[in-house]
């Protein structure tokens, strides 16, 4: 089959938005199925027909209603003939239009009076493309070939920049880039002490506005009274906006405040936030736990625990825990050093322990006291010991 693109030169240049009709002539075939191909891919175009000039001569059409840059490329027509595909000579379609931006100026944030650069690039066809820069409504400098880099020595306020690209088809304007001034960050807020123990405190906060410069770190300052001597200062990288304060003194009033810094410097400190570490749990177990059996039940007695350190705070009440081998168990809270035990089964062995508590919690348990079902009373000792009286 004779296949050729009619009325089309090897290169076809069309303006953007204009229609194009490519004609393909097929001779020597009675029933060709003409396909159009662009850059190797078949072009689906159901409303494009082809016409018979004679029984063995057909013309197919590819109509492009309104060409754009994406239509540019290499076109050819092809037919199947005897199981083989015959292809025509290609035509290169070039779509000309106003410049098309491949790089546009981006928004920036810069320190006051610091130098910076903006980039702009546009392409044709047609070439050449020249670039003109605008600062606000003022043109800066003459036309420069694309691509173009604008060097700015610095700004003292937020300023808008754009570029304009020119070629023989006209001009195109880029997006407007806003160059913002960087500033010191704002103070953090919502500062909370999230976890407290006797010697540690976890702190979390929300960062204030970053001043259009990345926050680099935050400082947590701790004192024992607002405005007093600094006890601790911790510098933490951010994010996350959290900090663990270690080695604090138990049962102590503290205050903390936070500030954050970007490349330009630190924010103001946030307001002081008071907190108090927890005290220590009692360090000693009650001693000499013993039992006295009476007609009405069982009386338990032990020695009073004296605080070893002021940080333990006031001690009391005492907590008594007992269990029997039938599975019965209970806890009892008493203010003094003597307790009357009821509700237990005298026919079963009884194990009793006692501890002293304070605001933090209970101290260590005493040695367990075993009251045997066969005993008239019990004595402090290991769980297996059974003592008669």
């Amino acid at each position: 089959a004779g296949l050729k693109l009619m009325g089309a030169p090897v290169k076809l240049t069309v303006s953007q938005g204009q229609p194009v009709k490519l004609n393909c002539s097929v001779e020597g075939m009675e029933e060709p199925d003409i396909q159009w191909v662009k850059d190797g891919a078949v072009v689906q175009n159901l409303d494009q027909l082809y016409i018979p000039v004679s029984e063995q001569h057909w013309i197919g059409f590819l109509s492009l209603k309104s060409v754009e840059r994406s239509d540019a490329g290499r076109y050819w027509c092809q037919v199947e003939d005897g199981g083989e595909t015959e292809i025509s000579q290609p035509v290169w379609l070039t779509v000309e239009g106003v410049p098309f931006f491949t790089v546009e100026p981006k928004d920036l944030a810069v320190p006051p009076n610091a130098p910076f650069q903006l980039s702009c690039e546009a392409v044709g066809p047609p070439e050449p493309v020249t670039i003109v820069w605008w600062r606000g409504t003022t043109k800066i400098g003459g036309p420069a070939p694309s691509p173009s880099v604008l060097n700015v020595t610095g700004v003292t306020q937020s300023t808008m920049f754009s570029c304009e690209a020119h070629n023989l088809k006209g001009l195109a304007s880029s997006r407007t880039a806003t160059v913002h001034l960087q500033a010191l960050p704002a103070a953090p807020f919502n500062i909370t002490v999230t976890k407290l123990s006797s010697s540690n405190a976890s702190v979390a906060w929300m960062p204030g506005a970053d001043g259009r410069a990345l926050l680099q770190s935050c400082t947590v300052q701790v004192t024992q009274a607002p405005g007093g001597w600094e006890v601790l200062a911790v510098v933490v990288p951010v994010p996350p906006f959290t900090c663990l304060l270690r080695d604090l003194v138990p049962a102590t009033n503290y205050s903390l405040r936070v500030r954050c810094a970007n490349a330009l410097g630190p924010s103001p400190y946030a307001d002081w936030v008071p907190f108090q570490t927890k005290g220590l749990a009692p360090a000693s177990a009650p001693q000499n736990l013993h039992a006295i059996r009476t007609d009405s039940g069982l009386i338990l007695e032990w020695e009073e625990v004296i605080p070893e350190a002021p940080l333990e705070g006031p001690l009391g009440p005492y907590k008594l825990s007992w269990v029997q081998d039938n599975g019965t168990q209970d806890e009892l809270t008493v203010e003094g050093t003597r307790a009357n035990l009821t509700g237990w089964d005298p026919q079963k062995d009884l194990i009793v322990r006692v501890c002293v508590s304070n605001a933090v919690g209970c101290g260590p348990w005493s040695q367990p006291l075993v009251v045997s079902s066969h005993d008239r009373a019990g004595q402090q000792g290991p769980p297996h010991s059974r003592t008669s009286w």
């Epitope: 009675e30 029933e31 159901l46 409303d47 027909l49 013309i59 209603k65 199947e80």
Partner: antibody
Amino acid sequence: EVQLVQSGADVKKPGASLTISCQASGYTFTDYWISWVRQKPGKGLEWMGQIRGPASATHYGPSFQGHVTISADRSTATAYLQWRSLEASDTAMYYCVRHQQQTSGGTIPEYYQHWGPGTLVTVSS
Amino acid sequence: SYELTQPPSVSVSPGQTARITCSGDALPKKYAYWYQQKSGQAPVLVIYEDKKRISGIPERFSGSSSGTMATLTISGAQVEDEADYYCYSTSTGGNYMVFGGGTKLTVL
């Protein structure tokens, strides 16, 4: 003169198969593209699909792909629209349409269309 | 799937200009065709490739296209122009055709 003659009206039950035809005369049958168009009672036109004379290449609308088959017999210059299993929603008038471009002396084509009179298909239990 | 949107109805007095619109995302790149269908008859193509009039169609029928909108204009509408009008075009990918929903033109 170009003429498209369509098969007569038909009544079928749901699940039945059916083939309707469109016979062309007055031109070389392979010099055509034929589309099938559906029009439900009181509704608009819907493009079902198309068959191209040379090589009988077919294209279908998304709603009709897999539900109907378009074919042609060159020896009798007839195009067909076939259903394997009809549904009540297939009740409609079906038109065949011949598309043609031809030149009058030059290479600028003029566009013509010929519509068949339509075939009314009723699917009812 | 691709859709073409038309107003359901347009009314004009005899001699006035009727404009029927058709919108579709692919219309900047694909041609629009316009059909006229009178009651009980098969449709007739009146405009092809946006603005080309089929031979035998009165000159008062014209077509245009801008962006995603194609328009059929009937300048000095006649009572006999009362009909349903359908736009028709190619899908975005070019692999199937689509009709608009149709516009009923009333010439009062």
